[in-house]
Amino acid sequence: PISAFAVDIPEIHEREGYEDEIDDEYEVDWSNSSSATSGSGAPSTDKEKSWLYTLDP
């Protein structure tokens, strides 16, 4: 969550409605929206905690 992490990557959409789901009742095929990297290549958008939440439903 620092501005130095800003890079040119595809838009990352924040997921809605987080609850503590029971594992067996919750199945979603998440697709990764950007390539693996670490630290300086991290996503930075104006969405909440976008640097930690990168998977789109």
Epitope: D23, N32, A42, Y53, L55
Partner: antibody, heavy 120, light 112 residues
Amino acid sequence: EVQLVESGGDLVKPGGSLKLSCAASGFTFSNYAMSWVRQTPEKRLEWVASISDGGSYTYYPDNVKGRFTISRDSAKKSLYLQMSHLKSEDTAMYYCTKDGGPREGYFDVWGTGTTVTVSS
Amino acid sequence: DVLMTQTPLSLPVSLGDQASISCRSSQSIVHSNGNTYLEWYLQKPGQSPKLLIYKVSNRFSGVPDRFSGSGSGTDFTLKISRVEAEDLGVYYCFQGSHVPYTFGGGTKLEIK
């Protein structure tokens, strides 16, 4: 019930390596970012590492960067912390923590911790 | 790094009193997305820390309404309106706006 159970803590010599594990249950593991937080013998809390929900992005403070590696295995619902080139100042209780989600707190669930002692 | 300074180090209170803990950051912890990721945790004796407050003033699920958080920019406060025995322990503030994330040194709430 949401639960995090750490294991792998041990007494290790300076320069040694150790891998901590955290078994998660009671929530959809792949939906949440995860972190390791440690508590020094002086009771100070220090953030150690974080990993994004899908595992693609990792974050570390400078004092562990290059020595520690956080990773996750969604199939096993497990979080890991590989620690190498350990120093005496890494001696601490290590907690596995769950993030609350994009709009919530960073560490909304904590494990009971596992003790790492670095000493010759 | 953002230094988080808590005062007082120790806070002796009588049960039923109001308690106030201050946390000051060495720089603004307003994130570029507009949010302030300031949190409060309580560690009771022999237990792991627990989340109380997130984003300055939001109570975590199950946290009694006698706990309230306030502040902005660099100055933040946790207030406990009527201290109960179960509130005793060490309180830590935390900022998650700038890497490295950092905790305050802790404030021990104890019986006077």
